[in-house]
């Protein structure tokens, strides 16, 4: 999907309100500095692209952060600002369903949630503070 | 761990040329801009050239421009420098560092690889 | 092009604070980084976007910058901070990345 016609100020809006908060949730008694960055991005299409990747596609090792509620509310957000979004993560999510279930946070997960942090902290500064 | 590994170095004699690698490991290499940077024996840092995170587009400094070439291939995690017509002054340590990017902003080199040392002589 | 000028050397006590400058044309409106280099290895950064510092590196390196002057601070000086310290930035007028010349920081 191409994220480049999404109206980023109200993902970011529903970022800070509420995404940002289960994520911090999420991290609870992590400090985000137990973690080096190992993903970035570059825009905001980028970064959302990013942020998609990294909180929708299982990795081995952390296969179940999209039923988290920061992802429902992340994949809300995106159905809702970006157009045709929702169309093209209908075999996703019927993919998603067929999965076990499995509530465990794993540390590697927490790594990964570090990471969404941090690309979502780089998609809500609209640009550098100079240069 | 995050690791920046350069190889491809040795001794070359003046005006042949030699290709760098820099394998990277434990980052999303397709998202960070990656950069060369030499250092002559005794002297500073000096910035050579940078490729964008999605290999779009290039800079180099005026040092090496028309000689030297830095392409990525995100698909084997590997940054490359193919260097032509070497002369003596480009003889030299040279790294591999990452550095996130914001637009056509790149900022800080926040890892860096060990080294790999050229030496151009006759 | 874009100029960074460093001092070639820097002398503290150990204990003491050591001072490290970067001059350069209106720097102040750039962001300047900060890297250490010890004999035989790659360089470290110790600084970024100016006054940010990665999670490795010690709370006693600090940095500032305004006006045409970056300054890198280094409290309670120890032998191991001896190294030689670069600034750098990424000029956008030309889109090359400049260094400073660096400073040699010795610990008395």
């Known amino acids: 999907y191409d994220f480049t016609n999404c109206d980023f100020q109200k993902i970011e809006a529903d970022y800070l309100r509420t995404i940002s908060k289960d994520l911090i949730t999420y991290m609870s008694g992590t400090k985000s500095t137990d973690f080096n960055n190992t993903v970035s991005c570059s825009n905001r299409p980028h970064c959302l692209t990013e942020i998609q990747s990294l909180t929708f596609n299982p990795t081995p090792r952390c296969a179940s952060l999209a039923k988290e509620m920061f992802a429902r509310k992340t994949k809300a957000t995106l159905a809702l600002w970006c157009p045709g979004y929702s169309e093209t993560q209908i075999n996703a999510t019927q993919a998603m369903k067929k999965r076990r279930k499995r509530k465990v946070t794993t540390n590697k997960c927490l790594e990964q949630v570090s990471q969404l942090l941090g690309l979502w902290r780089r998609f809500i500064r609209t640009l550098l503070k100079k240069q | 761990q995050m690791q920046l590994v350069e190889s491809g170095g040795g001794v070359v004699q003046p005006g042949r040329s030699l290709r760098l690698s820099c394998a990277a490991s434990?980052?999303?290499?397709?998202?960070?801009?990656m950069h060369w940077v030499r250092q002559a024996p005794g002297k500073g840092l000096e910035w050579v050239a940078v490729?964008?995170?999605?290999?779009?587009?290039?800079h180099y400094a005026d040092s090496v421009k028309g000689r030297f070439t830095i392409t990525r291939d995100n698909s084997k995690n590997t940054l490359n420098l193919q260097m032509n017509s070497l002369r003596a002054e480009d003889t030299a340590v040279y790294y591999c560092?990452?550095?996130?990017?914001?637009?056509?902003?790149?900022?800080?080199?926040?890892?860096w690889g060990q080294g790999t040392m050229v030496t151009v002589s006759s | 092009s874009y100029v960074l000028t460093q001092p070639p050397s820097v002398s503290v006590a150990p204990g003491q604070t050591a001072r490290i400058t970067c001059g350069g044309n209106?720097?102040?409106?750039?962001?300047v980084h900060w890297y250490q280099q010890k004999p035989g290895q790659a360089p470290v950064l110790v600084v970024y976007?100016?006054?940010d510092r990665p999670s490795w590196i010690p709370e006693r390196f600090s940095g500032s910058n305004s006006g045409n002057t970056a300054t890198l601070t280094i409290s309670r000086g120890e032998a191991g901070d001896e190294a030689d310290y670069y600034c750098?930035?990424?000029?956008?007028?030309?889109?090359?990345?400049?260094f400073g010349g660096g400073t040699k920081l010795t610990v008395l």
């Open positions: 560092s990452r550095s996130p990017q914001w637009e056509d902003i790149f900022e800080s080199m926040d890892i």
């Open positions: 434990g980052f999303t290499f397709r998202t960070y801009g």
């Open positions: 490729v964008w995170y999605d290999g779009y587009d290039t």
């Open positions: 209106n720097l102040g409106s750039k962001s």
């Open positions: 976007d100016d006054s």
């Open positions: 750098q930035v990424w000029d956008m007028s030309s889109d090359l990345v400049v």
